[in-house]
Structure formats: C-alpha cells, structure tokens
C-alpha cells in the first residue's frame, strides 16, 4: 500500500502522493462517471468554490491540507451545514478506531480543493469501516448508507488512498475493553453521556447472559430508579433487559462483580434497549453525585453525536 502524506506536507504534494491513478479496465467505463463535474444528475444552486478549512471545523482542521471545496461530496452547500454534520463524527475520531478515519471523513466533508472532486478509494472506506463500524454498532448506530464503500472508486483509479494502514506507531495501544465500559471520570463527561442517552437508570443487575455475540444485562425487579425515563415504557421498566452490542467477547471490569447498584445509560433502537454506558454506583464519587444531581440543568450539545462513550481510549 502507498506510503502517503504526513499532516505537515503541502496541500498539492499531499494530494498527489495520496492519489491512485493508473489507467485500468475502469477507464473503458469512463470511470463509471466518477469524474463528472458538476456531479451528473445534480445541479448545485452554487458553483463549486474553495475556502480555508476553518478552525471551528475541528474534524478536518488538522487533516493536512488548508483549503476545501464546497459543495462537498456529501452535497452540503454551506459551511454551517458542514460544521453541523461533521461535529457528529468528532467522538468517533477521538476513539481512534482507525488511523485513517479523519482522512476518510474529511475527503467527503471537506474535500481538497482541486478543479474536480476527488473521492476516497474504496479500500480507504473499507479500512475505516472495519475499524469504526463495530464501535458505532455497539452504540446502536449503523454505518450510514451514504458511506457505503462500494460507491467509491477502486484503488487503481484517481482517489484518496489508505495513508497509515492502522494506528500510527505513536498512538497508545488501544485496550480491548468494551466500548460501553470505557468510563468518563469528570462530571462534565458523565453529563454529556447522559445528554446523549435516551434513558438513565440506577439499578441492580440480576444476571448477565450471552446472546449471539451480545451481552444481555437482566435487571433485578426491585431497587430501580429512573433518573431519565426518555422513551422507556412501563413494560420496559418492569423487566429491564439491556443489550450490550458485541459485548460477549470484550472485558468490562465494572461488570465482573454484580453486587451493589449500577448507573446505566442507553438508547432505545427498534424496540431494543441498547446499553451505551455502565458505571458502578459509588456514593463516595463526587463527580457522579454531581452529574446525577445536575444532569437536567446541564446545557446539552445542540447536536447529538452518532455514538456516545469516552472521548479517549483508556
């Protein structure tokens, strides 16, 4: 695989180094219409323009090139729309599920400014998906249809290729703790998680079952306290069964011992209750007490990220 640009390289050198472009069988197809400009079947209300990637677009501000093209490849026509949509992906970037996630997402949200749009290569998309989709699914979010990798060009056509392969050598090793079991240690972090969850419950856990790659947490009948009910119906709370997506084969230290109470957060997806975070209830933990007490007065973000959880791997 190509060794491509570092974040410090100049924009054009960066792009030329990262592009694949040998003519192949694809050329006899006029590369399947990828090089159409404006995009075939789509007439933008504004002609393409180039502008600096602003500092308040943190997803892409540090991607390694300075100028982006609008409309972008996701058909966002204003910078405001790009910022709003891109912000949802920041937590995923923080998870460092794949080192090329930023390159991939920014090739779509803030494409490099050239005279025609350059798409990510299929293999770049697949690499990012392989690393990040399981994490998103753990929080009940499918990989979006818009990002289905078969829609992107083959690597031997003009496209942005895999840069780093997996994690850069400088990255800390990512532990295999279940995503739902990574913990926030500050009240702010806890409250952000609560904001992002449909429901928050203080409960006891009767037992844990393994079911088709998931862990199923079965709540004890008594001593349940709904801190945020959200979409939970009476029948949901009577017998609380929480699904920990892909949680059967990863460690979750706080669930090693089921004595005592737990603070659990989750989302309701297609009738199923998905666990998004779990903490041992600790009366002495000031951050937790503060977060629970002031969760409803906390100014939640205006947007909800695609998925929730700790901002950094532990």
């Amino acid at each position: 695989m190509w060794v491509a640009w570092s974040a410090r390289t100049a924009a054009l050198a960066l792009l030329l180094g990262a592009l694949h472009g040998a003519p192949t069988r694809g050329q006899e197809y006029d590369y399947y219409g990828w090089q159409a400009e404006p995009l075939h079947g789509r007439s933008y209300s504004k002609p393409p323009q180039c502008l600096d990637i602003p500092a308040d677009l943190p997803l892409c501000h540090t991607v390694g090139y300075k100028r982006m093209r609008l409309p972008n490849l996701l058909e966002h026509e204003s910078l405001a729309e790009v910022k709003q949509q891109a912000s949802s992906w920041l937590p995923l970037l923080a998870k460092r599920c794949h080192s090329d996630t930023q390159v991939f997402l920014c090739s779509l949200f803030a494409p490099v400014c050239l005279d025609r749009p350059i798409y990510p290569c299929r293999s770049l998309c697949e690499a990012a998906r392989a690393g990040c989709a399981p994490l998103m699914e753990a929080y009940g979010f499918p990989w979006p249809e818009m990002l289905h990798c078969h829609k992107f060009p083959l690597d031997n056509d003009l496209c942005i290729a895999v840069q780093f392969g997996h994690l850069p050598a400088t990255a800390p090793p990512v532990t295999k703790i279940c995503a739902q079991c990574e913990m926030e240690h500050s009240a702010d972090g806890l409250m952000e998680q609560m904001c992002s969850s449909d429901f928050v419950v203080k409960m006891r856990i009767k037992e844990i079952k393994i079911d088709n790659g998931d862990r199923k947490l079965i709540g004890a009948q008594k001593k349940k306290k709904l801190l945020k009910a959200g979409p939970l119906k009476r029948k949901d709370t009577k017998k609380l069964v929480l699904h920990m997506k892909n949680g059967a084969s990863c460690p979750c230290p706080q669930l090693d011992n089921l004595t005592g109470s737990f603070l659990v957060m989750g989302r309701k997806v297609e009738g199923q209750l998905l666990l998004t975070a779990v903490y041992r209830w600790d009366k002495k933990n000031k951050e937790m007490k503060f977060a629970v007490k002031f969760m409803f007065s906390y100014p939640c973000s205006l947007y909800y990220p695609f998925f929730y959880g700790a901002a950094e791997p532990h």
């Epitope: 069988r25 399947y32 219409g33 697949e126 289905h148 083959l154």
Partner: antibody
Framework: QVQLTQSGAELVRPGASVKLSCKAS????????INWVKQRPGQGLEWIAR????????YYNEKFKGKATLTAEKSSSTAYMQLSSLTSEDSAVYFC??????????WGQGTSVTVSS | NVVLTQSPASLAVSLGQRATISCRAS??????????MYWYQQKPGQPPKLLIY???NLESGVPARFSGSGSRTDFTLTIDPVEADDAASYYC?????????FGGGTKLEIK
C-alpha cells in the same frame, strides 16, 4: 480475464449445512466485492450478502442473517458461503458475482443446492 | 428496503421493433450524483449478464441496441431494434441501499 468458478451441485438433507465456494482468478482478489445471489427454480433473483476480501467486512441482507455466513480466503482467492439449517426453501441455484468498479459484472456459473430427505 | 417494480412482467415484440421495459423504485436510488441502477439479461441455465450500469452506461461488449435511461425512481431499458437473440428475462437492480434488491423480472419473447 476475470473468472469465477463455483463448486459443484449439492444434494443435502434438511437441517444440514453446506459450504459453497467461489474461486476467483484474473484480478486482485482483495479489490472486488464478492456477492452471493439466490435464484429459486423459475423465480427471480435475490441478493444474499457481499464480502470485501480486502478487509473481511461483510454486509448481509437481514433476511439471510443466521442462514448465510460469508468468508474469504485471500491465499487461495476463494470466497465461501455457508448455508445452515437447510430446508426445502433453500433449494435454489446460488451465484457468486464480483462487483468490480461499479457493478456486478462478473458472475460464476452457479451452484445448484437441492434440499431433500 | 427499496422495492423495484418492473413492468410489464412479460412482453412479446416483433423482430426489428422496439422493446421498452420499465423499473420503478419505491425511493430514490441516487447518491453522489449518480443513479445506482443496473440492468441484467438472463437466459435459462445461465448466470445474469450485465447490460447497463449506473442507469445509462452501456457495459463493454454489449450491443448499442441496448440503452438505459432515468434517474431517482424511474428507469427504462430500451432494446431497439430487437433481435432473435434478445429473447430472455431482464432484471433491474439497485445498490444505493442495503439490501441490494432486484426487480421481479420481465420475460421478453420475440414474435
């Protein structure tokens, strides 16, 4: 030139499993998706799933989750589909098809699976 | 799921005339400025053969008598003029969304 060669016809008992193979040649195996498509006698086409051998990522039609399992072996450029808990409804011809730049443009010859006691 | 409705289910056309097959999607199959719609021909005992990709592009080696048109939800396969060898079943297929889906098929008979 690109070729997909599928394994031979199978006659299997109800409740059993079967593993179909699709050997690819003439291109870099990790570049193209391998799709599996079902066709019951005298019926139309039904997409089962696809696998990207480069990453191992799989994408299933919800209808076939639990029924079909896709794998790919890079060393032999071969894709596999395992069908489990077979019933008469699974009697069909199964095609593998490579999705290259932007279409399923290469197809295997098909494998006939008959489920009968 | 995106449902593809093909019409007619069967069609008889005289040699040298035009055959038109329609495919309607239950929702748009367009993204990235392209229509992810395909047309295949299948003869008994054979695998399907790609004719048209991305709604209107002719697959290499396919006669120019075949053409595809349409966008979003309405698509058409046209064969003009029809030849004896075109007797077969024709399927539309979308892959804009998972699961990928096929139309029910149109059986073309040459009179």
């Amino acid at each position: 030139q690109v070729q997909l060669t599928q394994s031979g016809a199978e006659l299997v008992r109800p409740g059993a499993s079967v593993k179909l193979s699709c050997k690819a040649s003439g291109y870099t195996f990790t570049d193209y998706y391998i799709n599996w498509v079902k066709q019951r006698p005298g019926q139309g086409l039904e997409w089962i799933a696809r696998i990207y051998p480069g990453s191992g990522n799989t994408y299933y039609n919800e209808k076939f989750k639990g029924k079909a399992t896709l794998t790919a072996e890079k060393s032999s450029s071969t894709a596999y589909m395992q069908l489990s808990s077979l019933t008469s409804e699974d009697s069909a011809v199964y095609f593998c098809a490579a999705y290259s730049a932007s279409a399923m443009d290469y197809w295997g010859q098909g494998t006939s699976v008959t489920v009968s006691s | 799921n995106v449902v593809l409705t093909q019409s007619p289910a069967s069609l008889a056309v005289s040699l040298g005339q035009r055959a038109t097959i329609s495919c309607r999607a239950s929702e748009s199959v367009d993204s990235y400025g392209k229509s992810f719609m395909y047309w295949y021909q299948q003869k008994p005992g054979q695998p399907p053969k790609l004719l048209i990709y991305l709604a209107n592009n002719l697959e290499s080696g396919v006669p120019a008598r075949f053409s595809g048109s349409g966008s979003r939800t309405d698509f058409t396969l046209t064969i003009d003029p029809v030849e004896a060898d075109d007797a077969a079943s024709y399927y539309c297929q979308q892959n804009n969304e998972d699961p990928w889906t096929f139309g029910g098929g149109t059986k073309l008979e040459i009179k």
